[in-house]
Amino acid sequence: QLSLPSILPNENEKVVQLNSSFSLRCFGESEVSWQYPMSEEESSDVEIRNEENNSGLFVTVLEVSSASAAHTGLYTCYYNHTQTEENELEGRHIYIYVPDPDVAFVPLGMTDYLVIVEDDDSAIIPCRTTDPETPVTLHNSEGVVPASYDSRQGFNGTFTVGPYICEATVKGKKFQTIPFNVYALKATSELDLEMEALKTVYKSGETIVVTCAVFNNEVVDLQWTYPGEVKGKGITMLEEIKVPSIKLVYTLTVPEATVKDSGDYECAARQATREVKEMKKVTISVHEKGFIEIKPTFSQLEAVNLHEVKHFVVEVRAYPPPRISWLKNNLTLIENLTEITTDVEKIQEIRYRSKLKLIRAKEEDSGHYTIVAQNEDAVKSYTFELLTQVPSSILDLVDDHHGSTGGQTVRCTAEGTPLPDIEWMICKDIKKCNNETSWTILANNVSNIITEIHSRDRSTVEGRVTFAKVEETIAVRCLAKNLLGAENRELKLVAPTLRSELTVA
């Protein structure tokens, strides 16, 4: 840590005679520079040079050959490496006065006559005298304004909006400044910053637009940081809205975006007069071309129970916005002819949700359903098969006897989805068939009895059982069952000998 440079003469302030010469020496442990009141254009009679000495210190001399009122002000000696744009200069100061009977006030630039005040904050009206002994008064349209005066700075106080004039008398001669205009700016202690990107997803060639709005604040500096900045891409705009309240709208426009323009877009607002900073960020993605992704929330084979209400939901990610349609067996779904409805809902900027709704499922609703999403750059589809599940029911139970051989076949026709299983049961003691315990399942491996099953179509099945010889009356039961239910029917098989006796009778 270097100690502050030192100045010779070692004084806080010094009064220098008009037109005389003066020099200020600065000593430091590292390279030092001078900051002085005048701009470079005005400083033709200010000479700065480095001086060698044996102390091991760096010495820089500021010399003025002919002092004038314009040389009045603060001279600061500082280490070169410590100067930053943001911070006030750290160094050693000396204030020089050059009294001039014809110039009571230090000459100022035009911008110095505009005094910006934040709300009810104090401000400085910078009329500085060339002579520290000169009495000064401040006036506005109402008369003398009470305010504290410092010849190094000017009048300090809380001022209302309007023009102010500084007045001084030097050796009986009255001097007046041109009016200082106090202008009030709206500024809050906190920054209310809002960022808006109507879109965050683009494709190549489109124009990115991001806005940041600052509310109730006029003293704002806003900087954009974004990927295209390094290529000098992007055009800014500032719009000031005064009604119903103050709003500064900053817009960044990036025409003809490319994939390289993807990334974080950040606006950082800083209050020009206070160390108040606020940042907002949005992530923008630019795609080479449009895209579509389909994400179903169900499988490629789905089942619905008869009369059930069921929804099939498909998530779609797409840009640009897609057209979404549904097909059944490759034909467009005509909703008003069926109890099937579809809808599309936008969930987020590029996320959509499409629903296929079955209101009361019917057998004819079974089939292949396809969702198709398309935009100008892509087409995607997803197909699933829907089965309407119908409880099994027996359509027919008949017997068929084989004449003289005494054999008999029983046929049981059943329908349902999924296709029913058929089981056979037999009751040999006809008098006890009311009792469930009298029924036994007919096994496939029983001799003289053959069971077989044939699918007639997608939802109809026929089961057959053939008895080689029926010697006594038995009862046969067909049991058709699937996931949704079971149904059974019974049939009596009479032995051929008994049948002939009955016939004679």
């Epitope: 637009v209 800014t236 705009m237 025409p255």
Partner: antibody
């Protein structure tokens, strides 16, 4: 050959309307932002309006905001400027100009020959 | 809005002369500046973009320099076809603004 050709200018009374057209050829029109720039007789250039390639973004100079509307038809390679409530100070040669991004800058690299609009009673 | 000023407003010179036109922006615009040439009765023509880059097809006697707020267009050796009005334009911020122009005339 890359070319812009304006049409639709003429004499119109204050308060009247006019629609300017600009036909583009020789480049992929939809890939570029387009602009209208005007020049009053004996005066400098004044930017009037901007439209992005896909017509999603439009900007206007304060002097024409609310009165002029910029539009484009990429299928027809055409740019338009609908001018309503015309004033004497709108009298100028109107140029359509292509905005191009170069590294570290934007510039109007292609200009039309201009069309004269005279607002007078 | 960013104001653009140009100096001189006009200059009378001869073929073969070196001509320098300056353009100043009311606030820093980095190198987002273009220069245009406009001959009487014609549309403007882009000469320089990004403050110092020569547009293709433009003779190398034209050059641009500067950054921030102060920019210069130089014509190293004036040719008869260079007698025209020259405009600078900032392209960093809407509304795009042009300088008032500098007329280069024959002495």
């Amino acid at each position: 050959e890359v070319q812009l050709v304006e049409s639709g200018g003429g004499l119109v009374q204050p308060g009247g309307s006019l629609r300017l057209s600009c036909a583009a050829s020789g480049f992929t029109f939809s890939s570029y932002s387009m602009n209208w720039v005007r020049q009053a007789p004996g005066k400098g250039l004044e930017w009037v309006s901007y439209i992005s390639g896909s017509s999603t973004t439009m900007y206007y100079a304060d002097s024409v905001k609310g009165r002029f509307t910029i539009s484009r038809d990429n299928a027809k390679n055409s740019l338009y400027l609908q001018m309503n409530s015309l004033r004497d100070e709108d009298t100028a040669v109107y140029y359509c100009a292509r905005l191009r991004h170069f590294d570290w800058s934007y510039a109007f690299d292609i200009w039309g020959q201009g069309t004269m609009v005279t607002v007078s009673s | 809005d960013i104001q653009m000023t140009q100096s001189p407003s006009s200059v009378s010179t001869s073929v073969g002369d070196r001509v320098t036109i300056t353009c100043r922006a009311s606030q820093g615009i980095s190198s987002w500046l273009a220069w245009y040439q406009q001959r009487p009765g014609k549309a403007p023509k882009l000469l320089i973009y990004a403050a110092s880059s020569l547009q293709s097809g433009v003779p190398s006697r034209f050059s641009g320099s500067g950054s921030g707020t102060d920019f210069t267009l130089t014509i190293s050796s004036l040719q008869p076809e260079d007698f025209a009005t020259y405009f600078c334009q900032q392209a960093t911020s809407f509304p795009f603004t042009f300088g008032p122009g500098t007329k280069v005339g024959i002495k």
